[in-house]
């Protein structure tokens, strides 16, 4: 090996990576908010809706301060993978019923996938432990009715909104520790 010529800076610094991850998460949060408004407008639904297969909210915003970087990123990635799977399921199962939301749902899926890749890259750059993904979950059962699917859509978008809101706060807090 010859003398070190040095390399030009080829890719973003992890702190810059974290900044762009926060921006992407914020824009995804806004997409989800807009989509939730559209869904409520087109398919009004009273009260909160739950779906047993969705992840429970990772952490209250107040308890974020005690979290460590690896646990935040690992948990966030696991939860977002679950939401990605649910959005894919929703698009497949409810294609015709949610046709009016389709372009936006497709964009949401693409951006969610991009955010997951960004988180993985950030974990690689920091050399944080990347736990093996959970074993594949059993396939989600198709909704029992159109109304059941719409309730599921409300639950998925509502849960994703809360998770992304938590994610923005968590990532901003982590930035101060990097």
């Amino acid at each position: 090996p010859g003398p070190p010529p040095g390399s030009p800076r080829a890719s973003p610094d992890p702190r810059a990576e974290l900044d762009s991850t926060v921006l992407l998460t914020r824009s995804l949060l806004e997409d989800t908010r807009q989509l939730t408004i559209q869904l409520k407008d087109k398919f009004p639904a009273d009260g909160d809706h739950n779906l047993d297969s969705l992840p429970t909210l990772a952490m209250s915003a107040g308890a974020l301060g005690a979290l460590q970087l690896p646990s935040v990123l690992t948990r966030l990635r696991a939860d977002l993978l679950s939401y990605l799977r649910h959005v894919q399921w929703l698009r497949r199962a409810m294609g015709s019923s949610l046709k009016t939301l389709e372009p936006e749902l497709g964009t949401l899926q693409t951006r969610l996938d991009r955010l997951l890749r960004r988180l993985q890259l950030l974990m690689s750059r920091l050399a944080l432990p990347q736990l093996p993904p959970d074993p594949p979950a059993p396939p989600l059962a198709p909704p029992s009715s159109t109304w059941g699917g719409i309730r599921a859509a409300h639950a998925i978008l509502g849960g994703l909104h809360l998770t992304l809101d938590w994610a923005v706060r968590g990532l901003l807090l982590l930035k101060t520790r990097l």
Epitope: G6, S7, R9, A10, S11, D13, P14, R15, P70, L81, R117, Q120, L121, S124, R125, L126, A127, L128, P129, Q130, L131, P132, P133, L178
Partner: antibody
Framework: EVQLLESGGGLVQPGGSLRLSCAAS????????MHWVRQAPGKGLEWVAV????????YYADSVKGRFTISRDNSKNTLYLQMNSLRAEDTAVYYC???????WGQGTLVTVSS | QSVLTQPPSASGTPGQRVTISCSGS?????????VHWYQQLPGTAPKLLIY???ERPSGVPDRFSGSKSGTSASLAISGLRSEDEADYYC???????????FGGGTKLTVL
């Protein structure tokens, strides 16, 4: 400009020890996980060890576990690899690398031979 | 034996397009971990060519592109040039090792 400069390689007898160093400049060293990757003569790349950006996580390839120790000093922008109980099969060019790895040093040759 | 599998050699004539494949196992590529590609010119250190399956670091020509589908990934080089003659390695995080694994490398010859 990013620079990673390895040093400390050389000829050592089987069973002996060496300590490799890697001096980093041109980037925020303390924000990057750091790796050691080696390449035996005429062979492919083999990952050796990794340490997280803050030194709290360290992982090793099975082939070096219990013999090699990776460490870092963020105040000095320096990465280390302490190699004990060296074997002939550890003969290789050892590269220090940052991030994915995104950046690589030019390597230092370690020869284990009697 | 490498954890990721690449063809040992590939070749093409100037101007041609060549593709190098990389396949993995359940603890790396199959688990959804991203694939990165490195170029190692003779006598030099490896250089990052593609990261996160398809992203190009600044300074890497757009003749180089990467893709990933399910259990494998591939690197494509279009408009082949003599200076592309090098060894190419794929890498991915491996959850059983808690570190990256490399393919065995593909020696590209420009005829």
């Amino acid at each position: 400009e990013v620079q990673l400069l390895e040093s400390g390689g050389g000829l050592v007898q089987p069973g002996g020890s060496l300590r490799l160093s890697c001096a980093a400049s041109g980037f925020t060293f303390s924000s990057y996980g750091m790796h050691w990757v080696r390449q035996a003569p005429g062979k492919g790349l083999e990952w050796v060890a990794v340490i997280s950006y803050d030194g709290s996580y360290k992982y090793y390839a099975d082939s070096v576990k219990g013999r090699f120790t990776i460490s870092r000093d963020n105040s000095k922008n320096t990465l280390y690899l302490q190699m004990n109980s060296l074997r002939a099969e550890d003969t290789a060019v050892y590269y220090c690398a940052a991030g994915v790895p995104d950046y690589w040093g030019q390597g230092t040759l370690v020869t284990v031979s009697s | 034996q490498s954890v990721l599998t690449q063809p040992p050699s590939a070749s093409g004539t100037p101007g041609q397009r060549v593709t190098i494949s990389c396949s993995g196992s359940s603890s790396n590529i199959w688990s959804g971990y991203d694939v990165h590609w490195y170029q190692q010119l003779p006598g030099t250190a490896p250089k990052l060519l593609i990261y996160s399956n398809e992203e190009r670091p600044s300074g890497v020509p757009d003749r180089f592109s990467g893709s990933k589908s399910g259990t494998s990934a591939s690197l494509a080089i279009s408009g082949l040039r003599s200076e592309d003659e090098a060894d190419y390695y794929c890498a991915a995080w491996d959850s059983s090792l808690y570190g990256p694994v490399f393919g065995g490398g593909t020696k590209l010859t420009v005829l």
